[in-house]
């Protein structure tokens, strides 16, 4: 199919930092031991929110949101002497750019929350 | 410079899943609230190991390894009634392919452990 006008070309002088990326992913079926079984059983449980963007690759990214400010104790009560905090990870995604082009993307960094962990709070003593 | 023979071309019919990617990274300096301050304070603490590969982008990826089988209680003792488990995330990386080509890459999936969380163990009752 002819290149959409205004879509970058690998030879384009105004597009010097272009690489060609094969999307035929290696390790496509990485045996992802999904955290799905941990998010409920954790002392810092979280909910998973679907972050969807059709102009991005991958288009669906799951984001963790901690359920409580505190952590869940052995009796199932929330203990506010501890804090549930999100563990974040920087990931690479591809964003379609210009937006109407089928095969032209830009690398983008995203900070995503993967799950939550229970930490001892930092206590600030006021003099 | 002329394209190295055997290196993919955007028009190549045998390379239909190839897209052009602008490397001018968006959010290059994402304010990565590094988990560096959580890995010690967590009830499921972890160590960070440097996974390095100069032929991969990004070349350095930090992997979490839980320090204990159990979780650390309020007194700093390890409680084996709970389990420290790694939270895993699937990420995309770029690898040069074919390896001798200047501007041709392939997406690869990697499963990385980002941090650890403390979970109630699944108890299997033997009949």
């Amino acid at each position: 199919s002819p290149q959409n006008p205004g879509c970058p070309n690998a030879e384009d002088k105004n597009f010097p930092r272009t690489v060609m990326v094969n999307l035929n992913i290696r390790n496509r079926n990485t045996n992802s031991k999904r955290a799905s079984d941990y998010y409920n059983r954790s002392s810092s449980p979280w909910n998973l929110h679907r972050n969807e963007d059709p102009e991005r690759y991958p288009s669906v990214i799951w984001e963790a949101k901690c359920r409580h400010l505190g952590c869940v104790d052995a009796d199932g009560n929330v203990d506010y002497h501890m804090n549930s905090v999100p563990i974040q990870q920087e990931i690479l995604v591809l964003r379609r750019e210009p937006r109407h082009c089928t095969n032209s993307f830009r690398l983008e960094k995203m900070l995503v929350s993967v799950g939550c962990t229970c930490v001892t709070p930092i206590v600030r003593h006021v003099a | 410079s002329p394209q190295n023979p055997g290196c993919p071309n955007a028009e190549d019919k045998n390379f239909p899943r190839t897209v052009m990617v602008n490397l001018n990274i968006r959010n290059r300096n994402t304010n990565s609230k590094r988990a560096s301050d959580y890995y010690n304070r967590s009830s499921s603490p972890w160590n960070l190991h440097r996974n390095e590969d100069p032929e991969r982008y990004p070349s350095v990826i930090w992997e979490a390894k839980c320090r204990h089988l159990g979780c650390v209680d309020a007194d700093g003792n390890v409680d084996y009634h709970m389990n420290s488990v790694p939270i895993q995330q699937e990420i995309l990386v770029l690898r040069r392919e074919p390896r001798h080509c200047t501007n041709s890459f392939r997406l690869e999936k990697m499963l990385v452990s980002v941090g650890c969380t403390c979970v109630t163990p699944i108890v299997r009752h033997v009949a």
Partner: nanobody
Framework: EVQLVESGGGLVQPGESLRLSCKAS????????LGWFRQAPGKEREGISC????????YYTDSVKGRFTISRDNSKNTVYLQMNSLKTEDTAIYYC????????????????WGQGTQVTVSS
């Protein structure tokens, strides 16, 4: 015009130091891994060091590990090779080269090459 220009070569005695520079013009080094290569008379070109684009991680071949240090300054569009405790066998023409995103063990993967600078180690 896109080019890489090396400088800093010269004649030194064994045990002495040199600092090579490689300045890029016509393009930004931001998305490039930078490698240093050398070719001694009658020998094949060998890769001796590379610094990555994403996190400035440095890699060295065994023969220079602990003696050479590669670094980069993207604001100056320059990569450096600090060479200490030089030996006679380090005598060669030193080239710098730029590869998109990642280092590579394949010369063909490097998009841009400099013309080289001569380093002679002799007593």
């Amino acid at each position: 015009e896109v080019q890489l220009v090396e400088s800093g070569g010269g004649l030194v005695q064994p045990g002495e130091s040199l600092r090579l520079s490689c300045k890029a013009s016509g393009f930004s080094l931001d998305y490039y891994a930078l490698g240093w290569f050398r070719q001694a008379p009658g020998k094949e070109r060998e890769g001796i060091s590379c610094i990555t684009s994403s996190d400035a991680s440095a890699y060295y071949t065994d023969s220079v590990k602990g003696r050479f240090t590669i670094s980069r300054d993207n604001s100056k569009n320059t990569v450096y090779l600090q060479m200490n405790s030089l030996k006679t066998e380090d005598t060669a023409i030193y080239y710098c080269a730029a590869a998109l995103l990642t280092c590579s063990s394949y010369y063909d993967a490097y998009t841009y090459w400099g013309q080289g600078t001569q380093v002679t180690v002799s007593s």
